[in-house]
């Protein structure tokens, strides 16, 4: 049986059940290389409390559809009066990066995961030439996830004192020059994740090979190497390589750009101080507030919730968008869709799409940007579920009793972007995490 998601095959992936202090290792095409789980385990559960290992999915007992992968085992689970076996179930959804498997829940018999990934899309529009896992768990099982930094088009310009060259990088995947052919990037070779531009020429100085690594608490490292043979004439016989170290700052701060810290014989060392390198619980909340010791800030957007069936309305030329954030009030136009953002076509109001659901909510504060994300909306033709990204700005003189109002700014591949000036986005900082 052919591997259902070949892009995901090259790596052993990790997911965590924080509630029970359990680390899962997942290899969807072969077996995980953990002796204690046996030679054919595809899903290996490491109980960190008891320091024991249990196979909860066997690679030989795999069954697959386009959106679901199940691994059975021969291990009985003691559900009274049944002969059920322990199994793992991975539901796949279309995403814009390789993404990460997320532990959802577990019953006596089944361990459930969900994975939003380019590998599950109906079309190849989000697929990279080369992409590597872009997250890592530290020794305390806290997740550090750089997926939000991945550019689907274009690249980051590295801060470098050399006026004759420009070094462009992407995070965890190659630079897509076709979707956003900026003049300088146009000459970059396909597959490069680190592109050195000198005058009108561009050179591949690194491609992603291994996934993100954690070197010590709050320092993550990504290494790129030039795959093909053939040295560049300005590298003094050395093969080019790029090392990017992502550093979680010691306290809250605005974002910075990546900086070149060392360069020798085409070996480039880059340091990037960014809060995306911090653990995810420091940056994100599933509710509309971020507060407490862990986050160093106090943010509460719950006063933006609308009651009594009214919604915020944002004009998007062809469409009207109805928004109801930080609550579970049904939007009238989007009845029964559990939408937080509802897209209605002006010329045909029967064409209604959920552009993100209220129970699929993430509030993120990172590098000085406050963002509310609603995902899991109605599918587009690519298989990607519509989502909305609302970027908040602090405005102490916002109208509408300080609440302000959302403004639609554009759409890219079924992701809808809004800005929202409001006094409730004014962040109160604590100090040190």
């Amino acid at each position: 049986q052919a591997a259902p998601f070949p892009e995901l095959c090259s790596y052993t992936w990790e997911a965590v059940d924080t509630k029970n202090n359990v680390l899962y290792k997942i290899n969807i095409c072969g077996s995980v290389d953990i002796v204690q789980c046996g030679p054919s385990s595809a899903v290996c559960m490491h109980d960190l409390d008891t320091r024991t290992y249990h196979s909860v999915g066997d690679s030989v007992l795999r069954s697959a559809t386009r959106s679901l992968l199940e691994f059975n085992t021969t291990v009985s689970c003691d559900q009274q009066g049944t002969n059920h076996r322990v199994q793992s179930s991975i539901a796949f959804l279309c995403g814009k990066t390789l993404g990460t498997p997320e532990f959802v829940t577990a019953t006596e018999c089944v361990h459930y995961f969900e994975w939003r990934t380019t590998a599950a899309c109906k079309k190849d529009i989000f697929k990279a030439n080369k992409e590597v896992p872009c997250y890592v768990f530290d020794e305390e099982l806290r997740k550090h996830d750089l997926n939000p930094l991945i550019k689907l088009s274009g690249a980051y310009l590295v801060d470098d004192s050399d006026p004759d060259t420009s070094l462009f990088i992407n995070v965890c995947r190659d630079i897509d020059t076709l979707r956003d052919p900026g003049s300088q990037l146009r000459a970059c070779p396909p597959g490069t994740a680190a592109c050195l531009v000198r005058g009108h020429q561009a050179f591949d100085v690194g491609q992603p090979r291994d996934g993100l690594k954690v070197v010590r608490k709050d320092r993550l490292v990504l290494s790129y190497v030039r795959e093909e043979a053939g040295k560049l004439d300005f590298c003094d016989g050395h093969s080019p390589a790029v090392t990017i170290t992502f550093v979680c700052p010691s306290e809250r701060r605005e974002g910075t750009i990546p900086k070149l810290t060392a360069k020798s014989n085409c070996r480039y060392e880059i340091e990037w101080i960014t809060e995306y390198a911090c653990h995810r619980d420091y940056l994100e909340s599933k509710t509309c507030s971020l507060s407490g010791e862990q986050q160093d800030v106090s943010i509460d957007l719950t006063p933006l919730a609308q009651s009594g069936g009214s919604s915020y309305i944002s004009d998007g030329k062809e469409y009207l968008f109805y928004l109801n954030v930080c609550g579970e009030t049904e939007i009238q136009f989007c009845n029964k869709k559990q939408a937080a953002v509802c897209q209605v076509k002006k010329s045909d109001t029967s064409q209604v799409k959920a552009a993100g659901r209220y129970h699929n909510q993430t509030l993120r504060y990172s590098d000085g940007d406050l963002t509310l994300i609603y995902f899991g909306g109605d599918e587009c033709s690519s298989g990607f579920q519509r989502m909305s990204v609302i970027n908040f700005e602090c405005n102490k003189t916002a109208g509408n009793d300080g609440k302000g109002t959302p403004v639609f700014t554009g759409e890219v591949d079924c992701t809808y972007f809004f800005t929202w000036d409001t006094e409730y986005a004014c962040v109160h900082h604590h100090h040190h995490h």
Partner: nanobody, 116 residues
């Protein structure tokens, strides 16, 4: 006050059965992972069984097929049903509760002696 109290230990003949109970107070019981451990005289404490907050169960190889862990959320109690007991099962049995928001909580233990 948060505490766990074990009961049900005692003297039993080889091949016999016992059911240990561990009653919890002061915690949201259903949110917690529950474990049973045991410590035989002169030996280190060893893990016996786990009942995760989601419901999955795992057992040490030495007790697999003989012991069953279960819980009653209404009574805030976790049980360890021990069948086909052997002399090497003789130990003090402890229950432990853990969750991301709590430090581990241990009971005071209950003695199980398997002897003819």
């Amino acid at each position: 006050d948060v505490q766990l109290v074990e009961s049900g230990g005692g003297l039993v003949q080889p091949g016999g059965s016992l059911r240990l109970s561990c009653a919890a107070s002061g915690i949201i019981f259903s949110d917690n992972r529950m474990d049973w451990y045991r410590q035989a005289p002169g030996k280190q404490r060893e893990w016996v069984a786990t009942l995760a907050s989601y419901g999955w169960k795992t057992y040490a190889d030495s007790v697999k097929g003989r012991f069953t862990i279960s819980r009653d959320n209404a009574k805030n109690t976790v049980y360890l049903q021990m069948n086909s007991l052997r002399p090497e099962d003789t130990a003090v049995y402890y229950c432990k509760a853990s969750s991301p928001v709590l430090n581990d909580i241990w009971g005071q233990g209950t003695l199980v002696t398997v002897s003819s």
